[in-house]
Each structure stands twice: as C-alpha cells, then as structure tokens.
C-alpha cells in the first residue's frame, strides 16, 4: 500500500466574520494508526486548533466521525470566525507512539482569510466652534475590517470634498485594519444646516457603503449683526429704542442695555425667530423716559454671543430735540421681539 498522504485541497478559504469556516483534509490511507491534529501556523510556535485524541475545542466540530478507525476525512469546521482566526492551517497526521505520538505527515496548508466589515464610521469635528471663512478639520475613523483594501470619501451636502488625508493601519500584514482620515472644510455663513459625511466602501459591504455624519451646527458659530433704531414716540416723554440682533448661531446670547455706560437691563435671548438658513434673529426693546434725562443719552446695545467677547452698537438719543426716528439702517429679515419696559 502507498504511503499515506495528507491532502488539503483548498489552498485558501475566505470566510466572513461571524460565519463558520470549513477546513478540508483527507488522508489517502488508514495506515499508520494515530491521531490527526490541526495547527495554525508552522514550526515550534504553531498553535493547536484541534486534537483528535484529546482536549476540549468548543469552536471546532468535525465533518465526519473521527472516532472510527475507517475514517479518512479529517475536515473540521471552526465556528464564529473573527479576524484573529486568519492564518494558515495545517492538517497533520501523527503515528501512535510513546511517550508521545510522532508527527508523520503534514498537509500543504490552507490559508484562512477573514472578511470583516468595517465598524460604522465615526466623524468628529473640532473641539471649539469656528466662524465662517475659517477652515476646520473633521476626522473619520473606522476599525476592524479585513481585507485591507478600503475606499473612503468625504462629502459636504452631497458635494465630494478633495482636501483630505487618509491612512490605513497597520501598514504590514494584520488580522484586521483601521482607517483614519482628516478632511479640511471651509465654513460659510449658510452652513448651520450643512452636514459633513464620511463614506466607507469595502468588499464586505456589497456595494452599500457605511456613512458617518457630522452636523456643522455643532461646529459653526455665526456672529450676530446688530442694528439699533429709535422708534416713533409711543407716549409723552417716552422713546422706544430697539436692538435687532440678526443672523446668529447658536442661540446662546445675552444682551445688555447701557444708558450712558450704565447697565440698564440684561436679558437672555429666549423667543427667537429662525431663518431659513438656520440662523436666528432676535429683537429687544428699551423704553426710555426722556423726561428723566437732562442731557443727551447714549444708548448701547451690548451682545455677548456664545461666550465670545461682547460686540455692541450705540445710538445717541437727543433729549432736547423732538423725538423722531433715528439710527442706522441695516437690511432686516424676520424679526422677533422681546419687550421689557423699564422706567
């Protein structure tokens, strides 16, 4: 009878993570008597995957009944495959012996490659908000995929971005890989409703890429424009002055009225109106009792927006003159109002 050969018919096997890998192995003879063992890798550091003779291998099942003397099919199934299982697996026939069994013949090996899906891309923006015309960086990360080949694209509101850098780690062979990409985005005043999207395409995703998004509303700060106007006389000796705060984002805003440099009233923006572009408008009124003032009054609307240094706009109210509408005119959009009469 010809000497036993160990046949591993598959040079390579490709399995998706979470699935079961079947590693095929047959012997050409029932002689010599002795166990089959499966190893991952070769040489002294090889890892025992299955021993026909003894041991507990909960993830491994045999394709046929290996307890029988007449069995020549030593194929195994390994369940719940992860990228860490990738490697070359060897089916090795031993000859019965003492004190140890003697390695008799090895198969040529089967390379197990594991296809693992990338994790959902996580997009993160800068830690601090930035204002329009500034360039900000967004990062996108995805992990745990295999094989290494992967495609990453950036979009802003559906338009593909080109200013980005991408790295796939590690550079050499690994059981799984990670991708890290940084994109540069120039902010505009209209970006409150904008989205930045990181799109990852991989062979495991079957043409349905994964997306991670970041809303620019988390990143942008649109500083307000201020306009102070004097309204027609409402009553004898009273003048109504309004401060229109326009096109700001986010909503966090505190307004302070000063009369001749002295704080008259402080309020926080509450009932705001939202513009189509996502920015907000707000209006504050100040009712000034002119008879209480002998000299001209300098009214200042001071706004602290989103923790930034205050910006202000002033209006000179001439007490001697007959009150009439004065002030700077700036194009207004929808205005909200908030009235507090203080005498």
């Amino acid at each position: 009878e010809e000497e036993l050969q160990v046949i591993q018919p598959d040079k390579s096997v490709l399995v998706a993570a979470g699935e079961t890998a079947t590693l095929r192995c047959t012997a050409t003879s029932l002689i010599p008597v002795g166990p089959i063992q499966w190893f991952r890798g070769a040489g002294p550091g090889r890892e025992l995957i299955y021993n026909q003779k003894e041991g507990h291998f909960p993830r491994v099942t045999t394709v046929s009944d290996l307890t029988k003397r007449n069995n020549m099919d030593f194929s195994i199934r390994i369940g719940n495959i992860t990228p860490a299982d990738a490697g070359t697996y060897y089916c090795v026939k031993f000859r019965k012996g003492s004190p140890d069994d003697v390695e008799f013949k090895s198969g040529a090996g089967t390379e197990l490659s594991v296809r693992a899906k990338p994790s959902a891309p996580v997009v993160s923006g800068p830690a601090a908000r930035a204002t329009p015309q500034h360039t900000v960086s967004f990062t996108c990360e995805s992990h745990g995929f295999s094989p290494r080949d992967i495609t990453l694209k950036w979009f802003k509101n559906g338009n593909e971005l080109s200013d980005f850098q991408t790295n796939v780690d590690p550079v050499g062979e690994s059981v799984s890989y990670s991708i890290h990409s940084t994109a540069k985005v120039v902010l505009t005043r209209e970006d409150v409703h904008s989205q930045v999207i990181c799109e990852v395409a991989h062979v495991t995703l079957q043409g349905d890429p994964l997306r991670g998004t970041a809303n620019l509303s988390e990143t942008i700060r649109v500083p307000p424009t201020l306009e102070v106007t004097q309204q027609p006389v409402r009553a004898e000796n009273q003048v109504n002055v309004t401060c229109q705060v326009r096109k700001f984002y986010p909503q966090r805003l505190q307004l302070t009225w000063l009369e001749n440099g002295n704080v008259s009233r402080t309020e926080t923006a509450s009932t705001v109106t939202e513009n189509k572009d996502g920015t907000y408008n707000w209006m504050s009124w100040l009712l000034v009792n002119v008879s209480a003032h002998r000299d001209d009054v300098k009214l200042t609307c001071q706004v602290e927006h989103d923790g930034q240094p205050a910006v202000s706009k002033s209006h000179d109210l001439k007490v001697s003159a007959h009150p009439k509408e004065q002030g700077s005119n700036t194009a207004a959009e929808n205005t909200g109002s908030n009235e507090r009469n203080i005498y």
Epitope: V33, P35, K53, R69, N71, K96, S98
Partner: antibody, heavy 118, light 107 residues
Framework: EVQLVESGGGLVQPGGSLRLSCAAS????????MHWVRQATGKGLEWVSV???????YYPGSVKGRFTISRENAKNSLYLQMNSLRVGDTAVYYC????????????WGQGTMVTVSS | DIQMTQSPSSLSASIGDKVTITCRAS??????LAWFQQKPGKAPKSLIY???SLQSGVPSKFSGSGSGTDFTLTISSLQPEDFATYYC?????????FGQGTKLEIK
C-alpha cells in the same frame, strides 16, 4: 447491526492444527484492523495476533511461528490458522475489531472454545 | 513487552458505592490504554479507550483518567449489573498486553 461471529473451535490433540474463522457483518470489513484474543478458563485475556488493513501481521512470542492470521475481505472473513498446538493453547478465542481511530477494540465476538488435549 | 499491573486483584463493594481500579504500565504508554468489562461466560465489553474516551453506548458513570504509566477506572455509583471483572490493556505497541484483571464482587 455490527457483529462478529467466531467458529471452528473444538477438541484437538497436542501437535495438531485447527483453523478458526470470524464472520464480520454490518461494517466495511476491509477498513479495520482485526485481532484475535484468547482466554484460558479462569484466567485473564491474552492478545494473540493482528492483521492490519494492508495485510501486515503481528504476533506475541508465545504463538509466533505456529499461528497465522489472515483475512478475506471479499468474504468479510478473518481466520486464525493454528499449528503445532499445545495444551497451553487451550482457551476461548475471540475475534475483535480495532474499531476506534487508535485501533482500540470496540467490538468483540462471542468466542469459540479450543481444547488441546490428548 | 510492556507489563500491565492492576490493583486490587479483587474488590468488594456495595450498591451505590464509588469504586476506583488502578492500572500501571511498566513503561510510558502515552494514553493508549483501554478498559474492558467481562461477565462470566460472556465476551469482554469495551468501556474506555485512549485512557478517558467513552466507547459509544457506555454510560457516563464509567470514567477513565491517567497518562504515561498510571491510570484509573472509576465507577461512580455501583449497580447490580456492574459486578464483573475489569481488564486494562495497553495498545501503544505490539504485542498488546492486558492487566491480570480486577474482580468486582458484591459485598
């Protein structure tokens, strides 16, 4: 059903010969090593011979040169040709299948009695 | 040849008892050791192979352990049908050899 049935035992004089048979059924006979084991009355078990799948044979010193094991796969039969029999060969002879992957015996026949006496 | 020595040669026990029979090989036999049960007038029955693997159909009250030269057979809870003679056998190399047997009797 997996079964082994021995036959051919009997009374024989010292120096005589006897041929034992073992009929196998219920399994692929050619794929298993087959053994003979004997047991003298009131004594323990003694392994007598083996014939491997490829026809290779082994014997202990006590029977070597006198006993010959053979197999006929086409007939699912195992044989033990016993020559130059001695009184000490008196025993029940069992055939057994080396059925486990490591050639451990898993199936035994019911035995056939061989008596060597003058 | 490899010598196999069993102890004790005989053993008395009661129903429900747990008993252990030992077998020692004269040299290392790896774990190529089998245990058999034999009742009077009957053929041996295979219980265990490779020291601890249960033959198909054998109840789990039988268990084997050991490697190298020292081996044990344990019967966890004796029943009337378990009273018999037990043999160990090495089958690592020819000639295969048996222990002299342990007769398990009812007390």
């Amino acid at each position: 059903e997996v079964q082994l049935v021995e036959s051919g035992g009997g009374l024989v004089q010292p120096g005589g010969s006897l041929r034992l048979s073992c009929a196998a059924s219920g399994f692929t006979f050619s794929s298993y090593d087959m053994h003979w084991v004997r047991q003298a009355t009131g004594k323990g078990l003694e392994w007598v011979s083996v014939i491997g799948i490829a026809g290779d044979t082994y014997y202990p010193g006590s029977v070597k040169g006198r006993f010959t094991i053979s197999r006929e796969n086409a007939k699912n039969s195992l044989y033990l040709q016993m020559n130059s029999l001695r009184v000490g060969d008196t025993a029940v002879y069992y055939c057994a299948r080396g059925g486990s992957w490591d050639d451990a015996f898993d199936i035994w026949g019911q035995g056939t009695m061989v008596t060597v006496s003058s | 040849d490899i010598q196999m020595t069993q102890s004790p040669s005989s053993l008395s026990a009661s129903i429900g008892d747990k008993v252990t029979i030992t077998c020692r090989a004269s040299q290392d036999i790896n774990n190529y050791l089998a245990w058999f049960q034999q009742k009077p007038g009957k053929a041996p029955k295979s219980l265990i192979y490779t020291a601890s693997s249960l033959q198909s159909g054998v109840p789990s009250k039988f268990s084997g352990s050991g490697s190298g030269t020292d081996f044990t057979l344990t019967i966890s809870s004796l029943q009337p049908e378990d009273f018999a003679t037990y043999y160990c056998q090495q089958y690592v190399s020819y000639p295969y050899t048996f222990g002299q047997g342990t007769k398990l009797e009812i007390k």
